[in-house]
């Protein structure tokens, strides 16, 4: 007959499981419940995946692992506190008098409920890693945390290599025994202990759950340390950098922590499991019943099979681990789960030229000398596209790519960004906004949606801001509709006339050269170099200024570079920036200084691209530690990450203009990194590549 095999992880749990099985059988609950003994939750998950057991209750972290690695699904959830339903919230608490925010946690003193505990460790550490605030090299989360905070109390961390830092704030019991124990001997253990660590001034932030402050303040019956505490003297840290009252935990938290849930194989009927357990809880969840599902007192332990605080079990509608965990918790787990034993010893970097091979070799040696992990290996390829193929084929792991290549890498090869480059603000040549500039003209004002029939000025055919982005954007928005992939003809028919300088004018529509003026003698009209006075971004703006065109597609710096006395050439000497405006995608016009909010797209910085199964946090963790040593172009550590002058090349491995490598944060896909506008423009152009 049909039976459900529950997996127990300890002798007391096996004992309780046997009693539950007997109680269910006696009550005639079907199907039969059997008990299988596993050695741990992880072992039980393996037994279930191998069809040697069927069900177990897991916490959030284990649900993540079981779902991601073994395809198990949650089917029944625990409910605790009626107000919060099947979850509670992990929060970061600070004293109201302090100035700490989520962005200023580096260097502050931290209080944790215990090592590897959900709200005290897993969520805050995972969140800090996932959001890019905390970089972890070589999966050594303990080292990263001990370097990040200015001392902590993490009960249970005494056995680790970093106990000096992670146990620095712990105090043990009144006689100094049990310092840093993961037990009540340590006064700063558990939720109330971590809060006490904050309240007594040992730490600056406590990672606890949403109810902790309210349960330990305002004269609740408490031990002496808490009797004078007021909840209003504490605040929560929100993820956006603000702070909130301790009652605002629904809006201001690090993550909603999902309740424990019963997981089974994907082919198991979740409804069947719920019906079995529902019958059980109907009969065996109230006091005085012969067997109590939600109590472990009789077995001398806590939380056996189910959490003792469970008030009821409920069916899970969307039976996927992602849906049950929720995106906040899921993200935190992504940041945390890094198994040093499964971390590849090498990160294979794709190189494209002899100078790049030389620089990469030096980088590998320099990193190895400083014991940076994983070690770099250099693998050559013929082109960026060849790199993408080799990364997809798992022959290489990483390469730095430009915007258009990032698009191809993501769309065609499924690669994702692991870290990005960041340039100095002055550096308008490496990351910039594409803008549509017009004269400020109240009587003949038009918007981006009304460009048909206007005269247009472009830097040149194929230039990113002058052609690719604006034309791609107009195609994507449905204004320009090429027939038979003939973009040139479509553009020439969309605008009344244009100047789009070009190098190879064969079969080039004449209207795309109609506004061009050539050199001072009227020769070299429409050529793709500076002999054409309307060539380049400066030339396209001049085309607008001299009233040849109605709109110029340029970089966000172009207007500033050629107005307010910044360009002394006669055509520009008297120009004022305030006489020009930008056309915005939403149909509005804006001041030229509003380029960040009113642009056709931002040309994105380069990014390091990897396979989606690569742990991006270890890649950024490596680069972040490396740039501390080698990122400054004047460092004395024997290698310069962001300088190629020693190799007679430019932009090798990284752009030389890079000031630092940055985490991707929420931009975890190629679309996220590139931005919707840039992607739309590229899609507009690529839709025409027949």
């Amino acid at each position: 007959g049909m039976e459900v095999r529950w997996c127990a992880t300890s002798d007391p749990e096996q004992h309780k499981c046997g009693n539950m099985s007997e109680a269910f059988r006696e009550a005639g609950i079907q199907p039969s419940l059997l008990c299988v003994r596993g050695t741990s939750a992880d072992h039980c998950v393996q037994l279930i995946a191998a069809q040697e057991a069927d069900a177990i209750t897991l916490d959030g972290g284990a649900i993540y692992e079981a779902g991601k690695e073994h395809g198990l699904k949650p089917v029944v959830g625990e409910v605790y506190d009626q107000e919060v339903g099947t979850s509670y919230y992990a929060v970061a608490v600070v004293r109201r008098s302090s100035h700490v925010t989520i962005d200023t946690l580096k260097g502050v003193k931290s209080c944790h409920t215990g090592i590897n505990r959900t709200v005290g460790w897993n969520v805050p550490v995972g969140y800090l890693v996932e959001s890019g605030r905390l970089s972890v090299m070589g999966c050594d989360v303990l080292k990263a945390v001990s370097d990040y905070f200015g001392g902590s109390c993490v009960p249970g961390a005494g056995e680790t290599s970093y106990s000096e830092s992670l146990c620095r704030l712990c105090r043990g019991d009144s006689s100094g025994e049990g310092v840093c124990d993961k037990s009540p001997l340590e006064r700063y253990y558990d939720y109330s202990g971590a809060f006490r660590c904050l309240a007594e001034g040992a730490g600056d932030v406590a990672f606890v759950k949403h109810s902790t402050v309210l349960e330990n303040t305002d004269g609740k019956t408490l031990p002496s340390w808490g009797q004078a505490l007021l909840s209003q003297d504490f605040e929560l840290l929100c993820r956006d950098g603000s702070r909130a009252d301790v009652t605002e935990w629904r809006q201001c938290h690090l993550a909603r922590v999902p309740a424990h849930a019963v997981v089974v194989r994907a082919d198991t009927d979740g409804g069947l499991i719920f019906r079995l357990l529902n019958e059980g809880q109907r009969l065996f969840s109230h006091e005085g019943s012969s067997f109590q599902m939600f109590s472990s007192e009789a077995y001398g332990q806590k939380d056996l099979l189910f959490k003792d605080s469970t008030s009821e079990l409920v069916p899970i509608a969307t039976q996927t681990y992602e849906a049950w965990l929720g995106h906040e918790y899921l993200h935190a787990m992504k940041g945390l789960l890094c198994d040093p034993n499964r971390l590849p010893p090498y990160l294979r970097w794709c190189v494209l030229s002899t100078p790049e091979i030389q620089k990469c070799g030096d980088m590998a040696v320099a990193f190895r000398r400083q014991r940076l992990k994983p070690e770099i290996q250099c693998v050559s390829a013929k082109s960026p596209q060849h790199c993408m193929e080799r990364i997809q084929a798992e022959q290489v792991d990483a390469v730095t790519l430009s915007g258009e290549d990032i698009y191809t890498a993501g769309k065609t090869y499924g690669l994702v960004p692991a870290a990005g480059e960041h340039y100095a603000p002055e550096d308008s040549s490496n990351s910039y906004y594409v803008v549509a500039v017009v004269r400020r003209d109240s009587s003949h004002a038009f918007t981006l949606d009304e460009l048909r029939g206007k005269r247009s000025c472009h830097a040149g055919f194929g230039s990113p801001a002058g052609w690719d982005v604006p034309v791609g954007a107009l195609i994507q928005r449905g204004f320009i509709r090429p027939k038979d992939c003939d973009v040139l003809t479509a553009v020439s028919e969309f605008f009344n006339a244009s100047c789009v300088p070009v190098n190879n004018p064969k079969n080039y529509p004449s209207s795309l050269c109609a506004l061009c003026v050539g050199d001072e003698q009227g020769r070299n009209k429409c050529v793709g170099n500076s002999q054409e006075r309307y060539y380049g971004y400066r030339g396209a703006f001049r085309c607008l200024v001299e009233n040849a065109g109605d709109v110029a597609f340029v970089r966000h710096t172009t207007v500033f570079d050629n107005t307010n006395g910044h360009n002394s050439e006669p055509w520009a000497a008297e120009l004022r920036s305030e006489d020009y405006e930008l056309l915005c995608p939403n149909g509005a016009r804006a001041e030229v200084s509003q380029f960040a909010a009113c642009n056709l797209a931002q040309i994105p910085p380069h990014a390091v691209m990897v396979r989606p199964d690569t742990n991006i946090f270890t890649v950024y963790g490596l680069l972040d530690k490396a740039q501390d040593l080698f990122g400054d172009d004047h460092n004395k550590n024997g290698f310069k990450m962001f300088d190629s002058s020693n190799y007679h090349g430019q932009d090798l491995l990284f752009k030389d203009a890079t000031v630092r490598a940055v985490p991707v944060g929420e931009k975890t896909t190629y679309r996220g990194w590139l931005g919707l506008d840039y992607v739309a423009a590229l899609e507009g152009m690529s839709s025409q590549q027949c």
Epitope: A424, P425, E426, D427, S428, S429, H556, F560, D633, A657
Partner: antibody, heavy 119, light 112 residues
């Protein structure tokens, strides 16, 4: 009119953390680059770092291991934290803005706050 | 770092005189994008520095036209055509072509 105002303790003990706030009015810190500069006794100016409109930070490598610049956009404030201070960190600390309009020169400065590191 | 050297250290002038301050960079300040990010600031006694000139020769709004900047590559000059009492203070040049931005040591303009 853009105005920046530094605030924070004027005396910090050696090995402790120096924490300063820059409150901005007349402009939003979600636009442009927001900087910290310090001036030592004897007038020498040192650029410390910035936080950009998108939240990215850059730190002068000479301070990299000790400095943190953060912001709270809801308050239109940004912050400087300098850890493990010594007497050498005694200086007047300025916050300042950089935007494209002046090609990222520092066009508006706070009035400065003097910080002494001493036990 | 890129070293900015200002001369003279102190410049005594009479009101109405022309004053000239020199600033030399240890390497060229021409950025790969063609711009030269050399700026001048004035710090009056008891005040914070104020921007005078940006990108070599552009006067910031409200700066009188008696101030002018010139130069290229590594050598730059700030000129004050007719010194007035309100011009007294310490003048700093600064570059932001290379990171981190750096400042000159300052030139003190004082009454003779």
């Amino acid at each position: 009119e853009v105005q920046l105002q530094e605030s924070g303790p004027s005396l910090v003990k050696p090995s402790q953390t120096l924490s300063l706030t820059c409150s901005v009015t007349g402009d939003s810190i979600t636009s442009g680059y927001w900087n910290w500069i310090r001036q030592f006794p004897g007038n020498k100016l040192e650029y410390m770092g910035y936080i950009s409109d998108s939240g990215i930070t850059y730190y002068n490598p000479s301070l990299k291991s000790r400095i943190s610049i953060t912001r709270d956009t809801s308050k239109n404030q940004y912050y400087l934290q300098l850890n493990f201070v010594t007497a050498e960190d005694t200086a007047t600390y300025y916050c300042a803005r950089r935007t494209l309009a002046t090609y990222y020169a520092m066009d508006y400065w706070g009035q400065g706050t003097s910080v002494t590191v001493s036990s | 770092d890129f070293v900015m050297t200002q001369t003279p250290l102190s410049l005594p002038v009479s009101l109405g005189d022309q004053a000239s301050i020199s600033c030399r960079a240890s390497q060229s300040l021409v950025h790969s994008n063609g711009n030269t990010y050399l700026h001048w600031y004035l710090q009056k006694p008891g005040q914070s520095p104020k921007l005078l000139i940006y990108r070599v020769s552009n006067r910031f709004s409200g700066v009188p036209d008696r101030f002018s900047g010139s130069g290229s590559g590594t050598d730059f000059t700030l000129k004050i055509s007719r010194v007035e009492a309100e011009d007294l203070g310490v003048y700093f040049c600064s570059q932001s072509t290379h990171v981190p931005p750096t400042f000159g040591g300052g030139t003190k303009l004082e009454i003779k």
